[in-house]
Interface confidence: medium
């Protein structure tokens, strides 16, 4: 038994050109997590099923906000180490898939978003025991920098975690060939190998290839319980009348293992043994692949034929996801131009342009004094998204279709008086003043 | 923790109708699409309906028109009626939920439907 851990040091843009946008925006904050997922490194015909050696979630890391202009940098990570706890031998070779998601903080309806930013993955050889190896992945446009390695849990010891240290009362020497344990233990064990099959529970070995029963087991691989006297179960309270222990309920009545796992029962409880693709306690848990029809509103599903390898959704427009689960607001993008209003209809967007503007998108603009006139000789101005008239002297109005009063606003200055002519107006000066308007 | 435990189940004769229901525990509705699967002896399981967040529903071609999804988000219930029954639908029906955030599918233990001729 033993435990992988993983340290996830940096996750960000990767070097060279195309560097991604930051994940996050001022108007969506967002905070990153981590997933691990490990397999014992076989060859591809006999693959076991996902994350048989054991997955982990990180917590979430610090909410980060993008600074408008600044350059994406590292992005803030969860404190921690991402821990998956091995209770068999350690492989010694070993599937990894490590992916990185973003928890948006928005305002949505139902609580935050994720959404799968980063999948890396990579086969390693990892003794058990030894320091902690570096890597550094590619996905895109990130880049992933981790730290790895895997460790023995007291008593276990070895590359693989098999062999079991006990510290002894009395000191010995190591004979040849044999080191101690730890330094601080000193029994000098070669590494141990029960007999095959031999009841991880309920048996043990002090010699390589024995299997030795714990007490209430028996049968060469300690698999069958000892019956008391001439009863047939071990289990249950005992019978008032004949002292024999009545059979009770087990932990494997009714089979609690899902999807065809078959059921052992341990000390404590019970174990399944899940058959491929199948996984959890109660082997309740499978991958998904396009055949469980993954993306939603009518995204096209590529590739995941089985439950080892990813699948792609490709969404239709409107919508976006790892899954297509989230309807993109497109008005967002401010697609109608020159001032026009953006409805988006969900099958398709349309603009409501201003006046003077046309075009599926307002990019048209009109022009403004295409068929209108403006009458008694003035002339149409365009501009604004509407057309205007610069009439002539004596006329005004939109279309410059009404006769104006010249002397109405009183034109003529310290007390001159205004007279009407076909060609504008007059002002006759009082004594001591001059000039058209008798402003001198 | 997810579980799913179905109910409903039983034997019937063909042209009548079951309803199955599934009690799902752990299950957040907006991260995943609750679904029916069934798988009939010697024979690989196949989606029979999807219920997706925000109400879409999917249907196998063999049960359209005749089999209904619904979600009850407050009794955290997944139901499916199943009417005019033919005997090709003796299955075992499995409760599903198909989760993105995790990638992950969680099963239910199933309940076995037998339709007879």
């Known amino acids: 038994a033993g435990v992988f851990e993983l340290q996830i040091h940096s996750f960000g843009p990767g070097p060279g050109p195309g560097a991604p946008r930051s994940p996050c925006s001022a108007r969506l904050p967002c905070r990153l997590f981590f997933r691990v997922c490990l397999k014992p490194g076989l060859s591809e015909e006999a693959a076991e099923s996902p994350c048989a050696l054991g997955a982990a979630l990180s917590a979430r890391g610090p909410v980060y906000t993008e600074q408008p202009g600044a350059p994406a940098p590292d992005l803030p990570l969860p404190d921690g180490l991402l821990q998956v706890p091995f209770r068999d031998a350690w492989p010694g070779t070993f599937s990894f898939i490590i992916e990185t998601w973003r928890e948006e903080l928005g305002d949505q309806i139902g609580g935050p978003a994720w959404s799968l930013l980063a999948r890396v993955a990579g086969r390693r050889r990892l003794a058990a025991g030894g320091p902690w190896a570096r890597d550094i992945q590619r996905a895109g446009a990130w880049e992933l920098r981790f730290s790895y390695r895997a460790r023995c849990e007291p008593p276990a010891v070895g590359t693989a975690c098999t062999r079991l240290c006990r510290p002894r009362s009395a000191p010995s020497r190591c004979g040849p060939g044999l080191r101690p344990c730890a330094p601080l233990e000193d029994e000098c064990e070669a590494p141990l190998v029960c007999r095959a099959g031999c009841s991880p529970e309920h048996g043990f070995c002090e010699q390589p290839g024995e299997c030795r029963c714990l007490e209430g087991w028996t049968g060469p691989l300690c698999t069958v319980p000892v019956s008391t006297s001439s009863c047939l179960s071990p289990r249950g309270p005992s019978s008032a009348t004949t002292g024999c222990l009545v059979p009770g309920p087990g932990p494997c009545d009714g089979n609690p293992c899902a999807n065809g796992g078959s059921c052992s029962e341990t000390p404590r409880s019970f174990e399944c043994t899940c058959p491929r693709g199948f996984y959890g306690l109660r082997c309740e848990v499978s991958g998904v692949t396009c055949a469980d029809g993954p993306c939603f509103n009518g995204g096209l599903c590529v590739g995941g034929a089985d439950p080892d390898s990813a699948y792609i959704c490709h969404c239709p427009p409107g919508f976006q996801g790892s899954n297509c689960e989230k309807r993109v607001d497109r008005c967002s993008l401010q697609p109608c131009r020159n001032g026009g209003l953006c409805l988006d209809l969900g099958h398709a967007l349309r603009c409501r342009c201003r006046a003077g503007f046309a075009g599926p998108r307002c990019e048209h603009d009109l022009d403004d004094c295409a068929g209108r006139a403006c009458a008694n000789g003035g002339t149409c101005v365009e501009g604004g998204g509407a057309h205007r008239c610069s009439c002539a002297l004596g006329f005004g109005g939109r279309d410059c279709r009404e006769r104006a009063d010249p002397c109405a606003a009183r034109p003529c200055a310290h007390g001159g008086r205004c007279y009407a002519h076909f060609s504008g107006l007059v002002c006759a000066c009082a004594p001591g003043y001059m000039g058209a308007r008798c402003e001198f | 923790q997810v579980q799913l435990k179905e109910s409903g189940g039983g034997s019937i004769q063909a042209g009548g109708s079951l309803r199955l229901s599934c009690a799902a525990s752990?299950?957040?509705?907006?991260?995943?699409?609750m679904g029916w699967y069934r798988q009939a002896p010697g024979k690989g399981r196949e989606l029979v309906s999807r219920i997706q967040p925000g109400g879409n529903t999917y249907y196998a071609d063999s049960v359209k028109g005749r089999f209904t999804v619904s979600q009850d988000n407050a009794k955290n219930t997944v139901s499916l009626q199943m009417n005019s029954l033919k005997p090709e639908d003796t299955a075992m029906y499995y409760c599903?939920?198909?989760?993105?955030?995790?990638?992950?599918?969680?099963w239910g233990q199933g309940t076995q439907v037998t339709v007879s001729s």
């Open positions: 752990g299950v957040s509705y907006n991260r995943c699409s």
């Open positions: 599903n939920a198909l989760c993105w955030r995790e990638n992950v599918n969680y």
